[in-house]
């Protein structure tokens, strides 16, 4: 799946209206200087691919973000504005049910959420450049 056919304006609106607030709430108590993230994405579909990677897949210090409010809203937004996206998620939902539930220590995930904020900001910037 690639994100080429998504409605980027609608995704941007959803991000600014809700997802961004949830990400910032998750990061509350940390300073922007706490994490030295140089994240980048080259265009809008690529930014969404990177966002998908870091929102719904484990990394070494953060086992899962999928149950967080911003992740649920991200999934809903992509399902709504990216044709065919929902079909890619069926196996993932089934796989998640089989997996053992693991408690996630929030502060271990802060760096990853900081990366996500950077990617979303890049997404908005690439959108502004096109207009």
């Amino acid at each position: 799946y690639d994100f080429t056919n998504c409605d980027f304006q609608k995704i941007e609106a959803d991000y600014l209206r809700t997802i961004s607030k949830d990400l910032i709430t998750y990061m509350s108590g940390t300073k922007s200087t706490d994490f030295n993230n140089t994240v980048s994405c080259s265009n809008r579909p690529h930014c969404l691919t990177e966002i998908q990677s870091l929102t719904f897949n484990p990394t070494p210090r953060c086992a899962s973000l999928a149950k967080e409010m911003f992740a649920r809203k991200t999934k809903a937004t992509l399902a709504l504005w990216c044709p065919g996206y929902s079909e890619t998620q069926i196996n993932a939902t089934q796989a998640m049910k089989k997996r053992r539930k693991r408690k996630v220590t929030t502060n271990k995930c802060l760096e990853q959420v900081s990366q996500l904020l950077g990617l979303w900001r890049r997404f908005i910037r690439t959108l502004l450049k096109k207009q």
Partner: nanobody
Framework: EVQLVESGGGLVQAGESLRLSCAAS????????LYWYRQAAGIERELIAS???????NYVDSVKGRFTISRDNAENTMYLQMNSLKAEDTGVYYC???????????WGQGTLVTVSS
Amino acid sequence: EVQLVESGGGLVQAGESLRLSCAASGSGFGVNILYWYRQAAGIERELIASITSGGITNYVDSVKGRFTISRDNAENTMYLQMNSLKAEDTGVYYCASRNIFDGTTEWGQGTLVTVSS
């Protein structure tokens, strides 16, 4: 489906360096999130490094600053540069490729790294 083959393991002295490679064949490598796992004797397999299609990296604390994960999407290859190796880095290193949408994961067969002190 992606097939993965690791190489580059071996026996080194503490403080030395090694570079592991993970060559992929098949489709899907480009957008998948890629991982290096380590399994030491008697210990559960541990995720130590990850890299997204665009090169965003994350590391477990114990290897941060010593190990560097990278990927070459044109060559369908991932690397793990391991510097300042310690005895506790000994183990079998596995590469893995995970579909970012449905979570299906392909594994390599592993390569043994032994660090003697």
